[in-house]
């Protein structure tokens, strides 16, 4: 997260760290007791590595009573996701067991009504991604509030030049932005999950390259079919 601040500890009980061989790889969001939603591209280079999900965390390194690392029983990338596109960049991870819920671990309601969030709406994005252009990784969860950007502006040639489909949404990126390591994390508007940070190699913090988020409402049928 660029231009953000440290989050209040455990105030986002849905927040997950998707880990590869014990190190933070991507963000994720608990959407059901046994399911975490993230971004498909996160596992592209995972190969034979061990993928796990950390729940109930604020600090990645410090012991916390609510922290627990879960093995992944099943990883389900969206069937249409492809390495070279930002489209359909969703991944569902089934935990080895149902998460132990409590004040610091709780699923987040996700948007099912397929309607765009109004431009200008302030939404919260959180993650353990880099916090500066030098690539510094934070130990504790960071967050930032970002205004939603209308799709027409996001589709301008100097922005994302027509790449933003109806299944994607954008948020402003003027110094405050999601960045590398935040992919798969939640964009929350009005207490509801609206978007998932896409995991392309996008320049961060440049106002002409807005953050791109996969609209979960557009994938409600797929999410429901996997969780069923």
């Amino acid at each position: 997260i660029l231009g953000g601040r440290e989050a209040e500890a455990h105030a986002r009980p849905y927040m997950a760290s998707v880990q590869l061989n014990g190190a933070h790889l991507c963000g994720g969001v608990l959407v059901a007791e046994q399911w975490v939603l993230s971004a498909a591209h996160c596992l592209e280079d995972a190969a034979d590595g061990k993928v796990q999900v950390l729940l109930g965390a604020h600090s990645l390194s410090q012991p916390e009573p609510s922290k627990r690392l879960y093995d992944v029983l099943r990883a389900v990338p969206h069937p249409d996701s492809q390495p070279d596109t930002i489209d359909h960049d969703l991944l569902l991870l089934q935990l080895s067991e149902k998460a132990t819920l409590g004040p610091a671990v709780r699923p987040l309601p996700w948007q099912r009504v397929d309607r765009d969030v109004a431009p200008g709406t302030l939404c919260d994005v959180a993650g353990w991604g880099i916090v500066n252009h030098a690539g510094r990784r934070p130990d504790s969860l960071q967050h930032v509030l970002l205004p939603v950007l209308d799709r027409a502006t996001c589709n301008r040639r100097t922005h994302h030049d027509g790449a933003i489909t109806e299944r994607l949404m954008c948020a402003e990126s003027n110094r405050r932005d999601s960045c590398k390591g935040d992919s798969g994390g939640p964009l929350v508007c009005g207490g509801v999950l609206e978007g998932v940070v896409t995991s392309g190699s996008r320049v961060c913090g440049n106002r002409k390259k807005p953050g791109i988020y996969t609209r979960v409402a557009s994938y409600a049928a797929w999410i429901d079919s996997v969780l069923a």
Epitope: P119, D150, R151, A152, T153, N155, R156, R157, T158, H160, D161, G162, A163, I164, E166, V203, N206, K208, K209
Partner: antibody, heavy 116, light 112 residues
Framework: EVQLVESGGGLVQPGGSLRLSCAAS????????MNWVRQAPGKGLEWIGD????????DYNADFKRRFTFSLDTSKSTAYLQMNSLRAEDTAVYYC?????????WGQGTLVTVSS | DIQLTQSPSSLSASVGDRVTITCRSS???????????LEWYQQKPGKAPILLIY???NRFSGVPSRFSGSGSGTDFTLTISSLQPEDFATYYC?????????FGQGTKVEIK
């Protein structure tokens, strides 16, 4: 299939007004800026300006700012170009073109002739 | 405003020829996001322009590989490696980095 269809061109006297329409189909109208470009007979392409179909924000080439105005009817997925105080040198084919990707989609153009 | 000057204004060539059109801008067209929004369009009489190249060197989908773009800063080139009968048209460079966006004056490619 993305389609842009211009209409409203024709013969108009100097000092007169004309409103051109650009009807869009095959995509969500509010997802892309609309631009207007013109081409005088035997001449090159000249950008008039653009409009954001969500906010209505406009940007005009300074040469056209005082006499030309963009508007929208999102319910009809249509953009409009209102041209006032027309002069002989405004005689041209007028195009609308969607921005994103680049100017990949253009209308067929509509000819405006300003003559007495 | 940024002026784009194309050369030559017109040229005569034969099928199979290699054709090069240059476009020079009056100032740099590197956008503040680091990208260069230099595009090339083809236009045939009575028709709307067609996008060939975007961001200096990227061919738009469906554009034949004989079309290529290159350049940086203020000097840009469109090359047609082996001219085909359907390539006889007018070609325009365009910059979208700075408002007002502008077109070059065009280069007409005619049959020799």
């Amino acid at each position: 299939e993305v389609q842009l269809v211009e209409s409203g061109g024709g013969l108009v006297q100097p000092g007169g007004s004309l409103r051109l329409s650009c009807a869009a189909s095959g995509y969500t109208f509010t997802d892309y800026y609309m631009n207007w470009v013109r081409q005088a007979p035997g001449k090159g392409l000249e950008w008039i300006g653009d409009i954001n179909p969500v906010t209505g924000d406009t940007d005009y080439n300074a040469d056209f700012k005082r006499r030309f105005t963009f508007s929208l009817d999102t319910s009809k997925s249509t953009a409009y170009l209102q041209m006032n105080s027309l002069r002989a040198e405004d005689t041209a084919v007028y195009y609308c073109t969607r921005e994103g990707p680049s100017f990949a989609y253009w209308g067929q153009g509509t000819l405006v002739t300003v003559s007495s | 405003d940024i002026q784009l000057t194309q050369s030559p204004s017109s040229l005569s060539a034969s099928v199979g020829d290699r054709v090069t059109i240059t476009c020079r801008s009056s100032q740099t067209i590197v956008h503040d996001n680091g990208d260069t929004y230099l595009e090339w369009y083809q236009q045939k009489p009575g028709k709307a322009p067609i996008l060939l190249i975007y961001k200096v060197s990227n061919r738009f989908s469906g554009v034949p590989s004989r079309f290529s773009g290159s350049g940086s800063g203020t000097d840009f080139t469109l090359t047609i490696s082996s001219l085909q009968p359907e390539d006889f048209a007018t070609y325009y460079c365009f910059q979208g980095s700075h408002v007002p966006v502008t077109f070059g004056q065009g280069t007409k490619v005619e049959i020799k």
